[in-house]
């Protein structure tokens, strides 16, 4: 039961996380104009990964896409790439994890196959979360660097007669959404990996039982069945003897050298 709950919760947390990563990637407010001593501004600038926007006091908002690819800073391209990789990995992870869910029956898919799929999706979620966190952190670092550079050059002009106020940018809402979403995806991935341990068929110590068949005797010794390590393996490990009827979730598992950590 705990395995199913852990797997289900991991899936839901990852789903929320990936939705957040997608939302953050699409959001326009990655960086917003720093209002320092002026909380009300007539012209408010904010920028995303794909376009920059200006909201006037009049209520009019204008957004312009970055129609150039080569003209964009390498760091911005890197952040875009990290976020997209995170989304793609997360989406594939979600697809894999749906089929891996213990509560969903697909043909005669075994626990070993589901365990492998759970582990795969968990790893994908972890990498997806790390990509998002890395992307957002790179962008945040870029903002901090630019912020202090523009603070140093805050006012420029000749003899102080004509002032050019440089627009400074600070952290936008998308950064916080991205960090939280990346964290959730990471947590969801870890939960999936933990659930995988409980799903994997283990080497079980059964008492040796002798069956007397007509003509010859066959003794089944403990340790005869190993959990398959093959990715997506469909090997069926049939138990010869079970010391009592148990529901699927109640079957006890013991750690073995084949556990995925």
């Amino acid at each position: 039961m705990a395995v199913t709950a852990c797997q289900g919760l991991g899936f839901v947390v990852s789903l929320i996380g990936i939705a957040g990563i997608i939302a953050a990637t699409c959001m326009d407010q990655w960086s917003t104009q720093d209002l320092y001593n002026n909380p009300v501004t007539a012209v408010f600038n904010y920028q995303g990964l794909w376009r920059s926007c200006v909201r006037e006091s009049s209520g009019f908002t204008e957004c312009r896409g970055y129609f150039t690819l080569l003209g964009l800073p390498a760091m911005l391209q890197a952040v875009r790439a990290l976020m997209i990789v995170g989304i793609v990995l997360g989406a594939i992870g979600l697809l894999v994890s749906i089929f891996a869910l213990k509560c969903i029956r697909i043909g005669s898919m075994e626990d070993s196959a589901k365990a492998n799929m759970t582990l795969t999706s968990g790893i994908m979620f972890i990498v997806s979360g790390l990509c998002a966190i890395a992307g957002v952190s790179v962008f945040a670092n870029m903002l901090v660097t630019n912020f202090w550079m523009s603070t140093a050059n805050m006012y420029t002009g000749m003899g102080g007669m004509v002032q050019t106020v440089q627009t400074r940018y600070t952290f936008g809402a998308a950064l916080f959404v991205g960090w939280v979403a990346g964290g959730l995806t990471l947590i969801g991935g870890v939960m999936m990996c933990i659930a995988c341990r409980g799903l994997a068929p283990e080497e079980t110590n059964y008492k040796a039982v002798s069956y007397h068949a007509s003509g010859h005797s066959v003794a089944y010794k403990p340790g005869g069945f190993k959990a398959s390590t093959g990715f997506g393996s469909n090997t069926k490990n049939k138990k010869i003897y079970d010391g009592g009827a148990r529901t699927e979730d109640e079957v006890q598992s013991y750690p073995s050298k084949h556990d995925y950590v």
Epitope: A42, Q163, V165
Partner: antibody, heavy 118, light 113 residues
Framework: QVQLQESGPGLIKPSQTLSLTCTVS?????????WHWIRQPPGKGLEWIGY???????NYNPALRSRVTISVDTSKNQFSLKLSSVTAADTAIYYC???????????WGQGTTVTVSS | DIVMTQSPDSLAVSLGERATINCKSS????????????LTWYQQKPGQPPKLLIY???TRESGVPDRFSGSGSGTDFTLTISSLQAEDVAVYYC?????????FGGGTKLEIK
């Protein structure tokens, strides 16, 4: 077409509070725009007083902030200006206006002349 | 506050001639976010409220004759009337639309020579 009309007393004594109302017709005051007050002393230039949004959020000219209050009544489609402790320097034509693209003012009231005199 | 300085204070131009009014701001009115200059021009005739002519320094308001044009960037701006008509006699104001408080120039009185 949005139309604005100012109303209020034409003559007021020094130290009193000036109260003006701007009635909006041909459009809703709740349309999302900011509604402004601008004044023009006789023979002089224009001075921005402040604005109000239909939600009640305001922004005032720092030079007048301590004396100005702008309020809105969405049910009557009106917004009002109150200027306390008036002096002869507050004698002007008071305009209400609606902002638009480029933070410009394409819509103005005809203006109401307020004279501060004892 | 941004100080707007207009020149000249008054201008006399013959009918059909070009009229040029200048406006200088104490701070740049250029917004890098949308590459626009937040300067507005108004025309005011006696006994009337100001009439919007140009916003974003060079965008003509609908209904404004094309003889009116705006130019400039940063801190220096110009309003040009390519061929002066009798009805253009008025006072012209520039406005800082970039930051609060909005400020206006002192005005330029345009007359016919």
């Amino acid at each position: 077409q949005v139309q604005l009309q100012e109303s209020g007393p034409g003559l007021i004594k020094p130290s009193q509070t000036l109260s003006l109302t701007c009635t909006v017709s041909g459009g809703s005051i709740s349309s999302g725009y900011n509604w402004h007050w601008i004044r023009q002393p006789p023979g002089k230039g224009l001075e921005w007083i402040g604005y109000i949004h239909y939600t009640g959020s305001t922004n005032y000219n720092p030079a007048l902030r301590s004396r100005v209050t702008i309020s809105v009544d969405t049910s009557k489609n009106q917004f009002s200006l109150k200027l306390s402790s008036v002096t002869a320097a507050d004698t002007a034509i008071y305009y209400c206006a609606r902002i638009y693209n480029g933070n410009s003012f394409p819509y103005w009231g005809q203006g109401t002349t307020v004279t501060v005199s004892s | 506050d941004i100080v707007m300085t207009q020149s000249p204070d008054s201008l006399a131009v013959s009918l059909g001639e070009r009229a040029t009014i200048n406006c200088k701001s104490s701070q740049s009115l250029f917004n890098s976010g949308n590459q626009k200059n937040y300067l507005t021009w108004y025309q005011q005739k006696p006994g009337q409220p100001p009439k919007l002519l140009i916003y974003w320094a060079s965008t003509r308001e609908s209904g404004v004759p094309d003889r009116f044009s705006g130019s400039g960037s940063g801190t220096d701006f110009t309003l040009t009337i390519s061929s002066l008509q009798a009805e253009d006699v008025a006072v012209y104001y520039c406005q800082n639309a970039y930051s609060f408080p909005y400020t206006f120039g002192g005005g330029t009185k345009l007359e016919i020579k």
